[in-house]
């Protein structure tokens, strides 16, 4: 239950100090080169978070404006720039658009809610399925490779489109294509398991699009703090998505008598929620890019989109950290449950299970750990890199790294504690994850600084693939593995049963601490990074010839 | 060709126990799932007990009637499969077939595609 | 427990006649059942799998039709051999049950 396909989403967070009043000269130095002092109303109320459509642009570091490009023959409007005084003032926005952003923000944190519930409905009643169809476990291990693949290929595609064109459509078609999938699937005959798993892959697709685009939304509906505000709600739906997905997957299916209920209620709620985003998310432009116009769009192929993602050290990074936290979570969450139950076995507090569910209340208690440590850790995460901005620049990558490398301490400890404790096991669980869960809204914001508005889409999508790819697309079978390939070599007992599966899981914290590696190395290149992005974005600010993306 | 055969019945008094075999051949065993189905004389077909492959945990199901008093169970080396009767009752007298399930690898129907040709238990005394 | 309930009982035809055996669950089961064959004195036999797919070497005059509650297990021209007790089995959820049968006798 714990996915980081949106850990990478636009966040920003509270600028330094020191910078601020560079920043203000700065923006002050725009305004007037951009040449206007009188104010003349927006040319449309199109661009909620941006602040008058065409000119104070909201960059990573504050505001810039720009001479207005309106389509030829519309009146020109010079100088349609906020006439507010003072630092970060910003620009009149027509009455409604605070209102409408606070909605339009629940009503796309409501829509993960249900990606993450509709995921774990389907983990909540998976024995059932299993039971029903006769999927043996590489059947059950096909299902979740299909979606985390299908979702893996679909990430990039969706974030082309989602730099290129109207997002909130695609993120309605992306809800109501999953919805209808879901809901299909839950007529599948016990003899088309086939179906089953195409069905999974293709709402790895529909929800591939969500993870992608709707937190760049956010991002160009907020500045600043408000912005990490709104991104950490986002996040919380994660962990509050995949809770109730398990508990909507038990009690609906005990309700109704039948397992195939609970694949219904999020379909139903997903058809709701992506016509609420249809009507009441506005149709945002992407932070500053909106204001540059075509032109930009028309500069900047895919590829040369990719290439500076790749090149940019601090995304590259801290993409393979996240992908060090994503093999962890993924090959905790599946064996965890299973390994306690193992380790009550030998401690002789429990059977040997020959019928399932192996390990049901573990599953429970693991999951509402991670529930509350996904909830915790965000908002942990967001508090330590606030303080610490205070301090360095390079906060967010460090209370990453920190957070990265005291998981996988408590991580380890969870081994020696099976042994005696399951309790203390289970506070090892439980701190270990909530470091481990802390870089979710920061590796956010480490990407919302070192990457430029128009690319923000396909750099989630990218690091949501990578995480996939090298996370746990993988880890949890090479864990499986491994504890096969041990207890080959060794006599056949429940002890064994229980410490090959540990040994295997050994694993986990040395890529964590990997990972933390990744995120030092992160702090090392961002600041660099940070200043080479702002820079681009205080270029796209100039007359369109001198725009070098 | 697949080939079932079981062995192991008998005469027995109630409350004695059995271990009833069935010796499997021409498909890959470890990869199928198995059951027991009993049919008492001049009756219909019941169900017994069911034990899936490795890939599914070599997990168990049991029909009612016999939950707590019967085991499956299975050794993949000699491709062979059991029931351990334990308790046994005069209504458990039936002639007990070996019955292999469909294999699809990712899956398995639940329905009997092969039958052995039964071995008999009478419980008695 | 899905209960699965077979009409008639009994069914006395003569050869070369087409005829209809009927099983009904005590709840929907989609598609999921069996019907399989037994003659005197041998084991079962799988005929139709799934409420209508047909098993390789089963002849083609038999067949089924049916989804939710009401099967149907057809023998086209009944043959001499045909003559034996027909049991459906749901598998649509455990434990895996089975109809009393019916009797396809020679009238």
């Known amino acids: 239950m714990m996915c980081l396909e949106c850990a990478s989403a636009a966040a920003g967070g509270a600028e330094e100090e020191e910078a601020d009043a560079e920043r203000r000269r700065r923006r002050r130095g725009a305004q007037r080169g951009a040449g206007g002092s009188g104010c003349c109303g927006a040319r449309g109320a199109g661009g909620a978070g941006v602040s008058a459509a065409g000119d104070e642009v909201q960059t990573l570091s504050g505001s810039v404006r720009r001479a207005p490009t309106g389509p030829p023959g519309t009146p020109g409007t010079p100088g349609c720039a906020a006439t507010a005084k003072g630092p970060g003032a910003q620009q009149p926005k027509p009455a409604s658009l605070g209102r409408g952003r606070g909605a339009a923000a629940a009503i796309l944190s409501l829509g993960n809610v249900l990606n993450y519930l509709d995921r774990y409905t389907v983990a909540g009643v998976l024995l059932d399925i299993q039971q029903h169809f006769g999927v043996k476990d590489r059947g059950a291990g096909l299902l979740q490779s299909v979606f985390i693949c299908s979702f893996m290929v679909a990430a990039p595609i969706f974030g082309y489109l989602g730099d290129r064109f109207n997002r909130k459509v695609i993120l309605s078609c992306g809800i109501f294509f999953w919805s209808a999938v879901t809901f299909s699937s839950s007529f599948i005959p016990q003899q088309y398991f086939w179906l089953l798993v195409l069905s999974r892959g293709l709402v790895g697709i529909g929800e591939a699009s969500y993870s992608t685009i709707a937190p760049t939304i956010i991002g160009d509906l907020f500045t600043k703090n408000t912005r990490t505000l709104m991104l950490s709600v986002f996040y919380f739906a994660i962990p509050l998505g995949s809770g109730l997905g398990y508990i909507t997957g038990s009690s609906v299916k005990q309700a109704a008598g039948d397992w195939a209920w609970a694949l219904r209620v999020s379909p139903v709620l997903g058809m709701i929620t992506g016509t609420l985003i249809l009507i009441l998310v506005p149709a945002t432009k992407r932070g500053h890019a909106d204001q540059l116009g075509d032109q930009l769009k028309a500069r900047t192929s895919w590829l040369r989109d990719m290439k500076a993602l790749i090149r940019n050290r601090s995304y590259v990074f801290s993409s393979l950290a996240t992908s060090a936290v994503s093999f962890a979570t993924g090959a905790l969450g599946m064996w965890i449950p299973l390994y306690l139950h193992r380790a009550q076995v030998v401690q002789k507090t429990a059977e040997t299970c020959n019928s399932p569910p192996c390990g049901a209340k573990d599953s429970l208690i693991f999951g509402a750990i991670t529930c509350f440590t996904g909830f915790l850790g965000v908002v942990t995460g967001a508090g330590a890199t606030r303080w610490c901005r205070l301090k360095t620049q390079r906060a967010d990558p460090l209370v990453c790294a920190v957070g990265m490398l005291g998981s996988a301490i408590f991580i380890c400890l969870i081994f020696v504690a099976a042994k005696s404790s399951i309790v203390g096991a289970y506070i090892c669980i439980f701190v270990g994850e909530t470091l481990l869960f802390s870089n979710w809204a920061i590796t956010a914001d480490i990407l919302m600084y070192v990457v430029i508005p128009t690319r923000r889409a396909t750099a989630v999508a990218l690091q949501s693939f990578t995480s996939h790819l090298l996370g746990d697309a993988g880890s949890p079978y090479l864990i499986g593995f491994i504890s096969d390939l041990i207890r080959q070599s060794t006599k056949d007992s429940p002890l064994w049963e229980f410490l090959s599966l540990g040994y295997a899981l050994m694993l986990c914290p040395f890529v964590v601490v990997l990972g933390g590696m990744f995120f030092l190395a992160t702090a090392l290149f961002f600041v660099s990074d940070r200043a080479r992005a702002e820079q681009q974005v205080n270029q796209l600010a100039m007359p369109p010839a001198s725009v070098k993306v | 060709e697949v080939q079932l055969v079981e062995t192991g019945g008998g005469l027995v008094r109630p409350g004695s126990s059995l271990k009833l075999s069935c010796a499997t051949s021409?498909?890959?065993?470890?990869?199928?799932?198995m059951s027991w189905v009993r049919q008492a004389p001049g009756k219909g077909l019941e169900w017994v007990a069911l034990?899936?492959?490795?890939?599914?945990?070599?997990?168990?199901n049991y029909a009612e009637s016999i939950k707590g008093r019967f085991t499956i169970s299975r050794d993949d080396s000699k491709s062979r499969v059991y029931l351990q009767m334990n308790t046994l009752r005069d209504q458990d007298t039936a002639t007990y077939y070996c019955t292999r399930h469909e294999d699809f690898y990712y899956y398995s129907g639940y329905y009997f595609d092969y039958w052995g040709q039964g071995v008999m238990v009478t419980v008695s005394s | 427990d899905i209960v699965l309930t077979q009409s008639p009982p009994t069914l006395s035809v003569t050869p070369g006649e087409s005829v209809s055996l009927s099983c009904r669950a005590s709840q929907g089961i989609s598609t999921s059942i069996h019907w399989y064959q037994q003659r005197s004195n041998e084991s079962p036999r799988l005929l139709i799998k799934y409420a209508s797919q047909s098993i390789a070497g089963i002849p083609s005059r038999f067949s089924g039709s049916g989804s939710g509650t009401d099967f149907i297990l057809s023998i086209n021209r009944v043959e001499s051999e045909d003559f034996s007790v027909y049991y459906c089995?749901?598998?649509?959820?455990?434990?895996?049950?089975f109809g009393p049968g019916t009797k396809l006798e020679v009238k």
């Open positions: 034990i899936k492959d490795k890939n599914s945990n070599s997990e168990a």
């Open positions: 089995q749901q598998t649509y959820s455990l434990p895996l049950t």
């Open positions: 021409g498909f890959t065993f470890s990869d199928t799932w």
